[in-house]
Interface confidence: medium
């Protein structure tokens, strides 16, 4: 055909029929077989999808190409001829490739290659498992830490490369007829206490524990300074009743009588149980605060000093006495509203809640644990409504500048005590910066609408007296007669009502 009779505008993938018409090349299509419009285009025909009848056969895949198509074997398969492509099912000779034979080092150390149709897998030898980051690399299974618990609880698991052993723990021996090593090893405790193999000091009692023994102070005794209890080398001394004497410079017959009674209890301490002593002290305190007698005649600041001294002493005495209590829960309440709750527990990983009529305390048991002391922990709470009698007209010291809260508007106004005063203590006396907060829920007298409610603690001043403060305590929520407080230290706590409306709040307290 003369090139002058050929259309110059024919699109890509087409050829001219004459001077005014074009036709798509094989493998391409347009809206009609012959077209005369210069805007027409030739699209690739995808032979791999219907209505095309192309079939490549098993273990293969059709791949569309520009103007044509190819058949290729699936990954892990190849043509017998070694060629890469073919055109139809009749030419399909795809067969599985044995990757394991092709590359013997495909599975790394401690692994065996297993050929599969179109692929391969690595299997680890017994006692090994795949590394998560490399499914071809086998690594030793630590049967001891894998959670399979292959050994009897009386034995100690020792991991080896590809295997493990079960050996008797220190202080244990194989039961008669049992080996010491294979996974069927079973051991029994050696009772060092009854067999005389222990080395406990005479001031202690030997306690056989599973697999070992410890030396614990005799009841009413305490570890010598710097020596922990419940160790093999514990040495103890006779425990004395914690000293609690009247505050210096305070002249009150009522208070003297209280401390005389407390000292009497201290003198009798060895013959009484700690529980009875705690009950007796609480009864005396309850009666003291129900009828404070001449304490009322003391100047205000001295009343505050007495309260500080009582709150401090309570904490120390109860912490000391509670060391002699057995595991369990104690709840005492007294006529004038004094309440005492205490729980003694071995190390446990859970929250503890102590509930009283007017207050609840919730904290995590690990706060109570004294570091290095494996003995039981103590959490205690004392509610002392009557302490409010000694804490009238107490200033509130605000956080940022440690200033007494006063300004032009609120000159001379003092906060109002709404709740009981509660005192919290733990066996751990390092409670100034707790690793997790303690939550207190107070029931209290009604709040006057629009008045700010504050969670406070009793802070002992330099002069041994004290004031209310908010540092480290936040008010989580308050309703008419209940407030939730969260504190990061322990002391004595209460809920106060600020002496002004919320709308004209003192900025130092916001």
């Amino acid at each position: 055909q003369d090139s002058r009779d050929c259309a110059r505008w024919c699109p890509e993938n087409s050829s001219c029929v004459n001077a005014t018409a074009c036709r798509c090349n094989p493998g391409f299509s347009s809206s009609s077989e012959i077209f005369t419009s210069p805007t027409e285009i030739c699209d690739d025909i995808n032979e791999c999808v219907p209505p095309s009848k192309v079939s490549c056969g098993k273990s293969s895949d059709c791949r569309n190409t520009e103007g044509s198509y190819d058949c290729v074997c699936n990954p892990g398969y190849e043509l017998v001829s070694g060629a890469k492509t073919f055109k139809n099912e009749s030419e399909n000779t795809c067969q599985d490739v044995d990757e394991c034979q092709q590359n013997p080092r495909l599975c790394k150390s401690y692994g065996t290659c297993v050929n599969t149709l179109g692929s391969f897998t690595c299997q680890c030898l017994p006692g090994f498992k795949f590394k998560p980051e490399d499914p071809k690399l086998c690594t030793d299974v630590n049967e001891c830490t894998s959670g399979q618990n292959p050994c009897h609880s009386s034995t100690h698991c020792l991991n080896n490369v590809g295997s493990y052993q079960c050996r008797c723990r220190p202080g244990w021996q194989p039961i008669p007829g049992s080996p010491n090593g294979p996974n069927n090893t079973v051991c029994e405790d050696v009772d060092e206490c009854s067999s005389g193999l222990h080395q406990c000091d005479s001031s202690t009692i030997c306690f056989n524990t599973v697999g070992l023994y410890t030396c614990r102070c005799r009841p009413g005794w305490e570890p010598k300074h710097g020596i922990p209890n419940n160790q093999k080398d514990t040495v103890c001394k006779d425990m004395h009743f914690p000293t609690w004497t009247p505050p210096p410079g305070v002249h009150s017959q009522t208070l003297s009588q209280f401390f005389n009674k407390v000292q009497d209890l201290g003198r009798d301490f060895k013959t009484r149980s700690a529980k009875v002593t705690i009950q007796s002290i609480l009864k005396e305190l309850d009666e003291l605060l129900e009828a404070p007698g001449d304490l009322e005649t003391l100047p205000r600041f001295q009343q505050h000093c007495v309260a500080t001294h009582l709150l401090d002493g309570l904490e120390d005495v109860f912490r000391g006495l509670s060391k002699n209590l057995s595991i369990g829960l104690l709840n005492f309440s007294y006529p004038a509203g004094t309440e005492f709750s205490l729980e003694v527990q071995k190390q446990v990983d859970r929250n503890v809640t102590l509930r009283q009529n007017q207050a609840t305390m919730q904290l995590h048991w690990n706060l109570a644990q004294k570091s290095g002391d494996p003995g039981p922990s103590v959490v205690g709470l004392v509610s002392v409504p009557g302490m409010g009698k000694l804490l009238a007209e107490v200033p509130l010291v605000s956080e940022p500048e440690n200033q007494v809260v006063r300004n032009e508007t609120h000159q001379g106004l003092l906060p109002i005590l709404l709740s009981d005063i509660i005192s919290a203590f733990l066996s751990n006396n390092d409670t100034q910066n707790l690793s997790s907060p303690v939550t207190f829920t107070f029931s209290h007298r009604s709040v006057i609408p629009r008045q700010k409610v504050l969670c406070v603690f009793w802070e002992h001043g330099q002069n041994g007296c004290g004031h209310w403060a908010t540092t480290g305590c936040s008010t989580m929520g308050t309703r008419d007669t209940s407030t939730i407080c969260r504190c990061t230290h322990l002391s004595s706590f209460a809920v106060l009502m600020a002496p002004y409306d919320v709308q004209e709040e003192d900025p130092v307290l916001t």
Partner: antibody
Framework: QVQLQQSDAELVKPGASVKISCKVS????????IHWMRQRPEQGLEWIGY????????RYNEKFKGKASLTADKSSTTAYMQLSSLTSEDSAVYFC???????????WGTGTTVTVSS | DIQMTQASSYLSVSLGGRVTITCKAS??????LAWYQQKPGNAPRLLIS???NLETGFPSRFSGSGSGKDYTLSITSLQTEDVATYYC?????????FGGGTKLEIE
């Protein structure tokens, strides 16, 4: 509903004794002290003493020691006051009351009138 | 013992008027004071605790104030249902003691 229901009026002879009761309902009997008060005709109120039902602990106004004796029965949630060696001076209305949040009395009994007359 | 003195045994006030009842303690009682209302033939009823806390069920025309030894119960806009005897009580020290009472009447 918190209630303290007292026993009926008593007419007693001088020198005799009388035991009046106070039946509690609507709150925990063992959680609160129960107090007793005396009100003589056209006179004010006097605090006699209290009983703590939890353990039977009692406390008396010195003025009424030997005159009043307080007891409680937990099973029937009832508090009792026995008055002995009665004279005309003891003629009064006697009230029991529940201790409130502190030491005020937030719920009072109905009152029992004791008349001492020959 | 702490003596509680209510200066007026009787007070006669006109309807809608304002009443002030006073109570004086022989010693400081640090606001540990309650007021009771007693109507004829009935038991006393707690009206105010801790010197200023109005109990639920009483209207806001009743209020309490004071500190140290001197305390006051105020009633604004006296109503007929307020006719009663009012007692103060200290609960700072045992024995708990009451004032002699103030009988309120309408003139």
């Amino acid at each position: 509903q918190v209630q303290l229901q007292q026993s009926d009026a008593e007419l007693v002879k001088p020198g005799a004794s009388v035991k009046i009761s106070c039946k509690v309902s609507g709150f925990s009997f063992t959680d609160h002290t129960i107090h007793w008060m005396r009100q003589r005709p056209e006179q004010g109120l006097e605090w006699i003493g209290y009983i703590y039902p939890t353990d039977g602990n009692t406390r008396y106004n010195e003025k009424f020691k030997g005159k009043a004796s307080l007891t409680a029965d937990k099973s029937s949630t009832t508090a009792y006051m026995q008055l002995s060696s009665l004279t005309s001076e003891d003629s009064a209305v006697y009230f029991c009351a529940k201790r409130g949040y502190y030491w005020y009395f937030d719920v009072w009994g109905t009152g029992t009138t004791v008349t001492v007359s020959s | 013992d702490i003596q509680m003195t209510q200066a007026s045994s009787y007070l006669s006030v006109s309807l809608g008027g304002r009443v002030t009842i006073t109570c004086k303690a022989s010693d400081h009682i640090n606001n540990w004071l309650a007021w009771y209302q007693q109507k004829p033939g009935n038991a006393p009823r707690l009206l105010i605790s801790h010197a200023t806390n109005l109990e639920t069920g009483f209207p806001s025309r009743f209020s309490g104030s004071g500190s140290g030894k001197d305390y006051t119960l105020s009633i604004t806009s006296l109503q007929t249902e307020d006719v009663a005897t009012y007692y103060c009580q200290q609960y700072w020290n045992i024995p708990y003691t009451f004032g002699g009472g103030t009988k309120l009447e309408i003139e």
